[in-house]
C-alpha cells in the first residue's frame, strides 16, 4: 500500500507586495492521523507559518474547509505579502503523538515577492558651482524585489552616459536599493534645465518612476558688469549706470563708491528675467560734479550669492 | 458507500478467528480503518486502527493479542488468545479519529468466546 | 490512558425538550478539539454526529451541536424529535495515536 504523499506543485510562486500568496498542498492520504503545518526555511530555525492542530495565524487562512472530513487539501492563503515573507515553504505532515513527529514533507514552494521601488529621490550638490564645472547628481531608489533594475539618466531629455550605479546588497535578499551617481556638465543656459533619474522595475509594468532635480538649485552664474556714462541730464549732475547681466540667483547686492568711498549701497530688487532664467539689472548713481575738483573714480561694486565681490570701474572726468 | 464485517461465529477460549471489513463505493487506501468492539448490553470500546503497515496501532488492552492488516479494499482484524470477556460485536468503521472520525460503520459481526 | 466521563447516564425527556449531555477527559483531549459524538439505537451501528468537538458531519439536523475544548465538552439537542431517542457517546482522543476512549454512554428515554 502507499505510504502517504504530501504534493506541493508549485516549484515558485510570485506574488506582489501587498497581495496575498496561495500556497497550494495537497496529501494522498489521511493516514497517519495528525495535523499539518506549514513554514518558510528548512532546519531547526524554520519559522512555523501555520499549524493545522492550534494556535493563531492572524495573517493565514486555510483555502479549503480543513475541518471538512475528507479534506486531503491543505493549500493556504497569506494575506498582506511583504518583501519580508519570500523564501520557502514547507508542507509538512505531522503524526499524532507525545509529541507529534514529523512524518513527512513537500518538496517546497519558493515564494519570491515583487516590491515596487520607492520614488527615486534625486540630489544635487551642497554648494552651488558655476558653469564649464562638473557636479554630481545622486539617485536613491528602495524596497524593490527582484533584484534586476534599470536606471538612466537623462538632461533635458537628453540621455546621460556618465554615471555609476550600484545595487545593494550584492547577495541575496528580501529587497534591495540602488544608488546612482551621475557627473553632469554646467553651462550657463542651464537654469531651466532638470536632470532625471529614471527607474524601470518589472513591477511597475513599463511605467517607470523618475525622480527629478532642477538645476536651478545647483547652478549659479555670475554677472557680467558694465558701467556706462549716461547724458548730463541737469547743469553739474552726471547720470552714470551699472548694467549687471546675466546671473543666476536673484540674490545680489551692489555698492557704489567713489575714489574708493561707499557711496550707497542697495539689494537686487526689480529685476528683469531673461529667456533662459537668468537676471539683468541695472543701478544707476547720480553724480554731483561741482563737488569734484579733481576727475572721480567711480565704482560698481558686485557682490553676487554670498561671493568675493566683482567690480567694473569709470573714469569720470571733471573740467576745470 | 458501506462497510460490511465478516468472520464472526462462535469460538473456544484460547482460539484465533479472523474478521473482515469490506469497503464497497470507496477505496480504504486513503483511510484508516479502525475497530470497535460493544461487548452484550455494553458501551462502546475502541480496538484500534489500522492505516499502512507501519501506522496501525491498537489499545494498550488489545496490544498482542490483536492485529490487523488492509487492503485497498478489505481490512482485517486477528483477534487471538480469545477470552469470554472478548465476547462482543464488533465493528469495523472508516477513519482514524481527531480530524478523520469513525464514518461509516459497518453493521457489525457477533464474535462469541464459549467452550 | 484519556478517560472519558459522561453525565448524566440516563435522562427522560420529552419531544421539543432541550437536551444536554455533557463529557469530561481526564486530561485535555488531542489540539483541544479530538471529541466527537455518536448516536446508537438498539441493534444498530452507531452513527456519526458532530467532530473535533463543534462541526457538524454531514446529514445531521442542525439541531445537533457540540461545544467545550480542553477537558470540557457538551452535547446539545435543541428541541428533541422522537427519533433522537437513542443513546449518545463521546469519544475523546489522548495524545497517543491509539488513545482513543469512549464515554460509558447516556441513554435518553421518553418521559
Known amino acids: 500500500e502507499e505510504e502517504l504523499q504530501v504534493i506541493q506543485p508549485d516549484k515558485s510562486v510570485s506574488v506582489a507586495a501587498g497581495e496575498s500568496a496561495i500556497l497550494h498542498c495537497t496529501v494522498t492520504s489521511l493516514i497517519p492521523v495528525g495535523p499539518i503545518q506549514w513554514f518558510r526555511g528548512a532546519g531547526p530555525a524554520r519559522e512555523l507559518i501555520y499549524n493545522q492542530k492550534e494556535g493563531h495565524f492572524p495573517r493565514v487562512t486555510t483555502v479549503s474547509e480543513s475541518t471538512k472530513r475528507e479534506n486531503m487539501d491543505f493549500s493556504i492563503s497569506i494575506s498582506n505579502i511583504t518583501p519580508a515573507d519570500a523564501g520557502t515553504y514547507y508542507c509538512v505532515k505531522f503524526r499524532k503523538g507525545s509529541p507529534d513527529t514529523e512524518f513527512k514533507s513537500g518538496a517546497g514552494t519558493e515564494l519570491s515577492v515583487r516590491a515596487k521601488p520607492s520614488a527615486p529621490v534625486v540630489s544635487g550638490p551642497a554648494a552651488r558651482a558655476t558653469p564649464q564645472h562638473t557636479v554630481s547628481f545622486t539617485c536613491e531608489s528602495h524596497g524593490f524585489s527582484p533584484r534586476d533594475i534599470t536606471l538612466k539618466w537623462f538632461k533635458n531629455g537628453n540621455e546621460l552616459s556618465d554615471f555609476q550605479t550600484n545595487v545593494d546588497p550584492v547577495g541575496e535578499s528580501v529587497s534591495y536599493s540602488i544608488h546612482s551617481t551621475a557627473k553632469v556638465v554646467l553651462t550657463r543656459e542651464d537654469v531651466h534645465s532638470q536632470v532625471i533619474c529614471e527607474v524601470a522595475h518589472v513591477t511597475l509594468q513599463g511605467d517607470p518612476l523618475r525622480g527629478t532635480a532642477n538645476l536651478s538649485e545647483t547652478i549659479r552664474v555670475p554677472p557680467t558688469l558694465e558701467v556706462t556714462q549716461q547724458p548730463v541730464r541737469a547743469e553739474n549732475q552726471v547720470n552714470v549706470t551699472c548694467q549687471v547681466r546675466k546671473f543666476y540667483p536673484q540674490r545680489l547686492q551692489l555698492t557704489w563708491l567713489e575714489n574708493g568711498n561707499v557711496s550707497r549701497t542697495e539689494t537686487a530688487s526689480t529685476v528683469t528675467e531673461n529667456k533662459d532664467g537668468t537676471y539683468n539689472w541695472m543701478s544707476w548713481l547720480l553724480v554731483n560734479v561741482s563737488a569734484h575738483r579733481d576727475d572721480v573714480k567711480l565704482t560698481c561694486q558686485v557682490e553676487h550669492d554670498g561671493q568675493p565681490a566683482v567690480s567694473k570701474s569709470h573714469d569720470l572726468k571733471v573740467s576745470a | 458507500r458501506q462497510l460490511v464485517e465478516s468472520g464472526g461465529g462462535l469460538v473456544q477460549p484460547g482460539g484465533s478467528l479472523r474478521l473482515s471489513c469490506t469497503a464497497s463505493?470507496?477505496?480504504?487506501?486513503?483511510?484508516?480503518i479502525s475497530w470497535v468492539r460493544q461487548a452484550p448490553g455494553k458501551g462502546l470500546e475502541y480496538i484500534g486502527t489500522?492505516?499502512?503497515?507501519?501506522i496501525t496501532y491498537f489499545a494498550s488492552w488489545a496490544k498482542g493479542r490483536f492485529t490487523g492488516s488492509k487492503t485497498s479494499s478489505t481490512a482485517y482484524m486477528e483477534l487471538s488468545s480469545l477470552r469470554s470477556e472478548d465476547t462482543a460485536v464488533y465493528f469495523c468503521?472508516?477513519?482514524?479519529?481527531?480530524?478523520?472520525?469513525?464514518?461509516?460503520w459497518g453493521q457489525g459481526t457477533l464474535v462469541t468466546v464459549s467452550s | 490512558d484519556i478517560v472519558m466521563t459522561q453525565s448524566p447516564s440516563s435522562l427522560s425527556a420529552s419531544v421539543g425538550d432541550r437536551v444536554t449531555i455533557t463529557c469530561q477527559a481526564s486530561?485535555?483531549?488531542?489540539?483541544?478539539?479530538?471529541l466527537a459524538w455518536y448516536q446508537q439505537k438498539p441493534g444498530q451501528a452507531p452513527k456519526l454526529l458532530i467532530y473535533?468537538?463543534?462541526t457538524l458531519a454531514t446529514g445531521v439536523p442542525s439541531r445537533f451541536s457540540g461545544s467545550g475544548s480542553g477537558t470540557d465538552f457538551t452535547l446539545t439537542i435543541s428541541s428533541l424529535q422522537p427519533e433522537d431517542f437513542a443513546t449518545y457517546y463521546c469519544?475523546?482522543?489522548?495524545?497517543?495515536?491509539?488513545?482513543?476512549?469512549f464515554g460509558q454512554g447516556t441513554k435518553v428515554e421518553i418521559k
Open positions: 473535533l468537538a463543534s
Open positions: 489500522i492505516g499502512t503497515g507501519v
Open positions: 468503521a472508516r477513519g482514524s479519529a481527531w480530524n478523520d472520525p469513525f464514518d461509516p
Open positions: 486530561q485535555s483531549v488531542y489540539g483541544n478539539n479530538d
Open positions: 463505493g470507496f477505496s480504504l487506501s486513503s483511510h484508516g
Open positions: 469519544l475523546g482522543g489522548g495524545d497517543d495515536e491509539a488513545d482513543n476512549t
